[in-house]
């Protein structure tokens, strides 16, 4: 990537890390508003399996690990990348390394959840405070997950799918703050390792991920009125190990692993519509990549 | 019923190249992690290659990182290994195996040996 | 890496015999260990997986048990048909390594 100031510009959707062939280091942003790729500063350390999120204008990197021909190393690691000027700083690092971990921000704090060490699938959790660069664990989830997905809505944390060592899993469970207690809640029609989950307009959604025999492009969402999962229009291709977010009320599923190929691909969900379209292509095929998008 | 059976062996000279397959029936190589294992002739086990059927994330010894690739054709049902610069010391009974969840592998091949030599 | 030191590396036994094979892991590999057994000229077969639980259809007279980072096999009552080499492997971190072998032959 390159070392310069990345341009003032406003909503990007960034994505760090990754893995075709060897873990990756790469930092990119994408612009849906023109279509364009940013190349920025390079992560210090190759990841892929991490997580990304963004607290006060500032874009971290969470877990991972580093698959190289050089050896296999779980991470710890938490760094922080400031847009203005395009840097990267090593944070506090987690009590444990993460790989294929999920992230969700409630209240400027960071949640890591789950992921694995070697062959240890945690079911742990732990807070980051950014004002304070620590860490600090909470309740550990019913489950043990790695390749879960994480969101939040009204303040609660969900975990979402994952695989326990065993299984992979179409549970879901829900945190709470306020009590620091972990609830199970209704699961999914469908079983969902390494799942792209995010929220959007009052309702989580569970895109894609691997269900023990094969990648999967459908889509589902959970009302937490109703407290039902409902399917919704599959992704054009099937994937996990994906990366998501929300950009201007629409969902983006960047690139992952369909099986054969390291996809490139990026979809975008317009929920008025119910429909998936591709708009654009990552510079190249990759899957576990950290996704994150600039506050404005 | 399981069944692994690898072919693609032979005598090969030094710095050359050979690629192995893995032919399952019985089960998905899309639903397990496949690894390649060796065994020198009358020595011990070694752990090659392995692939993650979720990630398409491999794994390789540090003895063969950078030379060997492991691959699969889900639409085969099969799983290769591709060795390229190859040493005496590559030689071997190349085994294929599945990885059951617990990390161990429950279903071997009948095994194929290279022989690099010149 | 970690390495699994097995032992003995052979041993004479005689069929109806209680034979136990040892591996010491060089650090902490959790349960994350397994058991092969391998004939002559054949692939290995898994025998115990997570240090101590049997995969389906082996005998019951072989069983795993772990005390910290030693991991022992165990044969209660030799038969003729395990005469053989077992060797074990963690796989708790990468890359994963197996014990040299321990070749069970008959007295």
């Known amino acids: 990537g390159s070392m310069g100031h990345a341009p003032k510009v406003g909503r990007l959707i960034y994505t760090a890390g990754g893995y075709f062939r060897q873990s990756l280091s790469y930092l990119e942003a994408y612009n849906p508003s023109d279509g364009t790729w940013l190349d920025l500063a390079d992560l210090q350390v190759p990841r892929s399996g991490l997580a990304g999120c963004v607290v006060g204008g500032l874009l971290y990197a969470v877990g991972g690990r580093n698959n190289s021909p050089d050896g296999n190393t779980d991470s710890s690691a938490l760094d922080c990348y400031n847009p203005m000027t395009n840097q990267w700083s090593p944070c506090a690092p987690m009590s444990v390394p993460r790989n294929r971990i999920g992230v969700g921000v409630i209240d400027g704090h960071i949640y890591a959840v789950g992921g694995s060490h070697g062959c240890i699938h945690h079911n742990s959790v732990e807070r980051y405070e950014p004002e304070r660069d620590e860490w600090h664990l909470v309740a550990p989830m019913l489950t043990r997950r790695i390749g879960v997905g994480v969101a939040v809505l009204n303040r609660l944390l969900y975990a979402v799918g994952g695989f326990d060592g065993t299984n992979r899993l179409n549970s879901a469970e829900c945190y709470y703050p306020e009590r620091n207690e972990w609830r199970m809640i209704t699961a999914m029609n469908t079983i969902r390792s390494g799942a792209g989950v995010c929220v959007l307009h009052n309702c989580i959604y569970a895109a894609g991920g691997y269900d023990g025999q094969d990648q999967l492009n459908s889509v589902e969402r959970y009302d937490v009125e109703t407290e039902t999962w409902t399917f919704v229009a599959p992704m054009k291709h099937r994937r996990s190990a994906l990366g998501i977010t929300v950009h201007q009320g629409r969902i983006y599923v960047l690139g992952g692993y369909d099986g054969h190929t390291f996809l490139d691909s990026v979809e975008c969900y317009d929920p008025d519509t119910d429909t998936w379209s591709e708009v654009t292509r990552m510079t190249s095929g990759r899957s576990g990549v950290g996704v994150a998008v600039t506050m404005e | 019923e399981v069944q692994l059976v690898e072919s693609g062996g032979g005598l090969v000279q030094p710095g050359g190249s050979l690629r192995l397959s893995c032919a399952a029936s019985g089960f998905a190589i899309s639903a397990s992690s496949i690894h390649w294992v060796r065994q020198a002739p009358g020595k011990g086990l070694e752990w090659v290659a392995s692939i993650d059927p979720e990630t398409g994330e491999t794994l390789y010894a540090k003895s063969v990182a950078g030379r060997f690739t492991i691959s699969a054709d889900t639409s085969k049902n099969t799983a290769y290994l591709q060795m390229n610069s190859l040493r005496a010391e590559d030689t071997a009974v190349y085994y294929c195996?599945?990885?059951?969840?617990?990390?161990?592998?429950?279903?071997w091949g009948q095994g194929t040996l290279v022989t690099v030599s010149s | 890496d970690i390495q699994m030191t097995q032992s003995p590396s052979s041993l004479s036994a005689s069929v109806g015999d209680r034979v136990t094979i040892t591996c010491r892991a060089s650090q902490s590999v959790s349960s994350a260990v397994a058991w092969y057994q391998q004939k002559p000229g054949k692939a290995p077969k898994l025998l115990i997986y997570?240090?101590?639980s049997l995969y389906s259809g082996v005998p019951s007279r072989f069983s795993g048990s772990r005390s910290g980072t030693d991991f022992t096999l165990t044969i209660s009552s030799l038969q003729p048909e395990d005469f053989a080499t077992y060797y074990c492997?963690?796989?708790?971190?990468?890359?994963?390594?197996f014990g040299q072998g321990t070749k069970v032959e008959i007295k």
């Open positions: 997570s240090a101590s």
């Open positions: 492997q963690q796989s708790y971190s990468f890359p994963s390594t």
């Open positions: 195996a599945r990885e059951r969840a617990e990390y161990a592998s429950d279903a």
